[in-house]
Interface confidence: low
């Protein structure tokens, strides 16, 4: 099944050219998406090409600039945020990246009523996080790990927390592990719907072991970066949740929200907070052994000014076959009665589906069902529920948007996107205005991405927001590779794969094969999305076949496949890549003497283990920033899938699943090991230990480090990396330069 639709081809074939590495490194064929910044049911903001902030009204058709590019430029602003009362805008500048989501910045407040910046009681700098209240123009911000509140932008700040300390106590922002592995945000504070209350997390990292690595910089002496980072089995952060009344913040101060007794009895995590109303909040907690999650609904007690979380409002979600949830435990979407909610979790057949919980989880009403999975609940209105799934035509790597009418019985289901642009668009996400009056659909492929605006009642398309015309024109004279998504049936397991084939692919010829692998738990590589990237170039210009395979442990195909890797990382993921390669060889067009594998992060771990599998299938391979032992990686992630590295738990498999244990097996492959020295995520330690083991085994290998680069190897390092990897592969495959 060829997924990439045919393009408008130039009549003269000889004007077509292959992709170059330079095209990829320059981002020549990158695409744009359009996500409206909704500010009401029918209005949104968008930053124009010339950097004016423009307000659009869908119903009147009007648009006007609320903030000029001149004002933006006056403080070198790279981002903005309009207060809900539309009186002020914060302007963000001096962006300084920290970890995956976190950054610090300088903030200026611009008064739209008088066209001037607010003077007096200016915000300190740099600020770690800042946000408006959902109503009015209160500001909450985090500075030096403490939370501050302003009733109005020009007011003096009210200090909410006082115990914040760098690398010790984090208020309103997550520590490293919560940011990366639990919350996936830069913030840990949440306004109630009307801004009456502000909830926040306090993370105590006092007893967490610290990862320390050198940052070389330009000075005579390197500096040391210290991050409290709990590796598998280590002491974890201690979390507490507080809520403060922002109208009268000084009365009782922050009030702690109690932890459910069944959770508090041993190590635990806080996983998310969802406000239901101004006086009802929902917290989700997770045992350290992450197969039990508790959702706790808490109510404000006016008489005591405290938060009460009755046991009758605790809902337990437990997995008997793996960990709780998918990558994360799903979050609830509350209905208008402010007590019942919709949530995605495994049904009795082991597929993740939407359930409606009114009183107890046991009495949950299943809303969707089938041998496919519901992936995200976008919005619940009084009469509709919008969600995405991979149901359509049984392709796990697709995403379509559905609407279920919940106002009628039985509920009727409609696929909003399935037939809109069927060839071009099979992978969607959506963004809804207030009350789902309007929504934007963003299609990621397999054709050129397109963003459109729709009426929330009728689903009718109103206009195209972005169709990437320039990209379409630029690609007209490019020989793009062909792509196909198919499946292999092996021993009761379905292995979906994506194959990227050279433009002039001929089944009767033999081609070198490169396997690109990630393979981490709850990941998905085989997706119907558009991309012109490094592997597109390798197929287009260098004539390689590239394959991506979703094996056991990957997501959205049911719990049997997902939880197969539970407590056994590094086994089945590798086996399934090898199985797929054998099947590809059987197809007849693969040169079995020229097969390589490469991956990054978890993919680096899998590629390393595949190379060291002793099968003789792979001639060479690359591992970028690989995990080499699960004892070196973060507790929250690792223990979710592996349990604890203790004798009475799973220490044996922790030891058996290291790359170092297989050092001897690298003797007959060409191995390129790559890592950034300032990788805060998968520490350089991982590659250092692989290198040491290979040296000790007297095994030859190639290596490249990137000084002061993190897990993303960005900037100039990216160019160097892909150039270096290209040379390595071409040499491995005996392709001339």
């Amino acid at each position: 099944i060829v997924l990439r639709p045919p393009r408008v081809h130039n009549s003269e074939e000889n004007t077509m050219r292959a992709l170059t590495l330079k095209d990829i490194l320059n981002g020549t064929f990158s695409y744009k998406t359009f996500f409206p910044n909704w500010i009401s049911g029918q209005e949104y903001l968008h930053q124009s090409a010339d950097n004016n902030i423009v307000l659009y009204n869908i119903e009147t058709g009007q648009s006007y600039t609320i903030l000029s590019n001149r004002t933006m430029k006056s403080v070198n602003a790279s981002n903005y945020g309009l207060s809900p009362d539309r009186q002020f805008v914060y302007l963000e500048s001096d962006y300084s990246k920290l970890w995956r989501y976190s950054y610090t910045a300088t903030y200026y407040i611009y008064d739209l009523s008088n066209g001037e910046f607010v003077r007096g009681n200016e915000l300190p700098r740099p600020i770690q996080y800042l946000c408006w209240s959902p109503v009015g123009s209160k500001l909450a911000y985090v500075y030096q790990n403490n939370i501050y509140l302003k009733q109005r932008p020009g007011d003096p700040p009210f200090q909410i927390t006082f115990n914040g300390r760098e690398n010790k106590i984090f208020n309103g922002i997550p520590d490293w592990v919560y940011e990366e592995e639990m919350l996936a945000t830069k913030y840990a504070l949440w306004w109630s719907p009307n801004g009456k209350f502000l909830a926040y997390a306090e993370f105590n990292d006092t007893d967490i072991p610290v990862i320390a690595y050198s940052y070389y910089g330009d000075e005579q002496y390197p500096r040391t970066i210290n991050i409290p980072y709990p590796k598998a089995g280590a002491k974890n952060p201690f979390v507490r949740i507080f809520i403060i009344d922002t109208t009268y913040p000084a009365y009782v101060g922050p009030q702690e929200v109690p932890v459910p007794a069944m959770i508090a009895s041993s190590d635990y995590y806080f996983s998310w907070l969802t406000w239901v109303t101004d006086e009802r909040v929902c917290l989700q907690w997770l045992k350290r052994v992450q197969n039990v999650s508790v959702l706790s609904i808490c109510d404000f007690r006016e008489d005591w000014q405290t938060w009460d979380c009755p046991k009758t409002q605790e809902h337990i979600e437990e997995s008997r076959t793996g960990w709780a949830g998918g990558f994360f435990v799903s979050t609830p979407v509350f209905s208008y009665d402010a007590i019942s909610y919709y949530k995605i979790f495994s049904d009795k057949d082991g597929y993740k589906h939407i359930h409606y919980i009114k009183d107890t989880v046991e009495n949950a009403i299943q809303i969707t069902s089938g041998k496919w999975e519901a992936i995200n609940i976008f919005r619940v209105t009084q009469d509709s529920l919008f969600y995405s799934s991979n149901e359509f035509e049984d392709y796990p790597g697709r995403r379509n948007i559905y609407r279920i009418s919940i106002g009628s019985y039985p509920p009727s289901k409609k696929c909003v996107t399935c037939h809109l642009r069927k060839e071009r668009c099979q992978y969607y996400t959506a963004s809804f205005s207030d009350y789902a009056k309007y929504y934007a659909l963003v299609c990621y492929g397999p054709g050129i991405p397109i963003s459109t605006l729709h009426d929330g009642r009728t689903d009718q398309e109103i206009k195209i927001l972005e169709e990437n015309k320039e990209l379409e024109n630029a690609l007209k004279n490019i020989q793009l590779p062909k792509e196909e998504i198919k499946k292999l049936e092996v021993d009761e397991i379905t292995l979906w794969y994506k194959m990227i084939l050279p433009p002039q692919f001929d089944r009767s010829k033999k081609y070198p094969l490169l396997i690109q692998v990630y393979g981490g738990p709850c990941s998905q590589s085989v997706r119907s999305v558009f991309a012109v990237n490094w592997i597109s170039y390798l197929a287009s210009k260098e004539g390689m076949v590239i394959a991506l395979v979703d094996g056991r442990g990957t997501a959205f195909q049911g719990d049997k496949l997902l939880y197969a890797v539970y407590r056994k990382l590094g086994v089945y993921e590798v086996e399934d890549q090898i199985t797929a390669v054998r099947k590809f060889i059987e197809m007849g067009f693969i040169d079995e003497k020229r097969i390589a594998i490469w991956g990054w992060s978890y993919g680096g771990y899998v590629s390393s283990l595949a190379l060291a599998s002793g099968t003789g299938l792979f001639k060479c391979g690359i591992a970028v920033a690989p995990v080499s032992s699960w004892e070196y990686y973060a507790s929250v992630y690792t223990e979710r899938f592996m349990g604890l590295p203790t004798k009475d738990d799973n220490l044996e498999h922790y030891k058996n699943s290291t790359v170092m244990a297989r050092a001897e097996y690298f003797r007959n492959v060409d191995y390129l090991l790559i890592h950034g020295t300032a990788d805060d995520n998968v520490h350089f330690q991982n590659s250092a230990q692989i290198a040491k083991a290979l040296v000790n085994a007297q095994v030859d290998f190639q290596a490249m480090w990137y000084s002061d680069q993190n897990h993303g190897l960005s900037g100039l390092s990216t160019n160097h990396l892909y150039t270096h990897m290209t040379h390595f592969l071409k040499q491995c495959f005996s392709l001339s330069d």
């Epitope: 115990n163 009268y248 101060g253």
Partner: antibody, heavy 123, light 107 residues
Framework: QLQLQESGPGLVKPSETLSLTCTVS??????????WAWIRQPPGKGLEFIGN???????YYNPSLKSRVTISVDTSKNQFSLKLSSVTAADTAVYYC???????????????WGQGTLVTVSS | DIQMTQSPSSLSASVGDRVTITCRAS??????LNWYQQKPGKAPKLLIY???SLQSGVPSRFSGSGSGTDFTLTISSLQPEDFATYYC?????????FGQGTKVEIK
Amino acid sequence: QLQLQESGPGLVKPSETLSLTCTVSGGSISSSSYFWAWIRQPPGKGLEFIGNIYYSGSTYYNPSLKSRVTISVDTSKNQFSLKLSSVTAADTAVYYCARPSYYGSGNYYFAFWGQGTLVTVSS
Amino acid sequence: DIQMTQSPSSLSASVGDRVTITCRASQSISSYLNWYQQKPGKAPKLLIYAASSLQSGVPSRFSGSGSGTDFTLTISSLQPEDFATYYCQQSYSTPPTFGQGTKVEIK
């Protein structure tokens, strides 16, 4: 160093209104991240919280006194005031102004106090 | 309102004695409890906050413990300047309330 000083008449007749002012020095009422409180202590008895005010004028009063209490703030003079109407002999007490402090554990305490002023309700 | 009950209401002790004062809350107040010392004609002075944290400048002979409903203030070795009245105060819910006081007198 923050200092608080209560001032006002030491004698008030029954049914009249007790009025006290607290002058803050060593810190600005409006630039501080704190709130300002009144607490009283009848002779030989324990302490009773009356109410508090934020620099913006937001107030909270002890429900037991709410109907009779008004606390106001004058940021230009760096002062806040207490009015207690319809007083009786039971309102005879030492009246303290105080500034509570609190931090991330959800706890707060009264860290700064005035020296107190005795108000007697008697005809 | 949360009632705070101190015991004893008064006690006699000698210099060097170990003195313990208890405070009981009418409902659980977690660790949201503070202790004050008051001398005649003076304003109260903060000793302990958050049940067990010593306010800076307060001698280490003062210590606090407890959580939930039962709390204790301990003076490990009574000094002449410690003869005073001691109050507990909860900040768990509004309004903040104080105990009735414990008077420590010279034996």
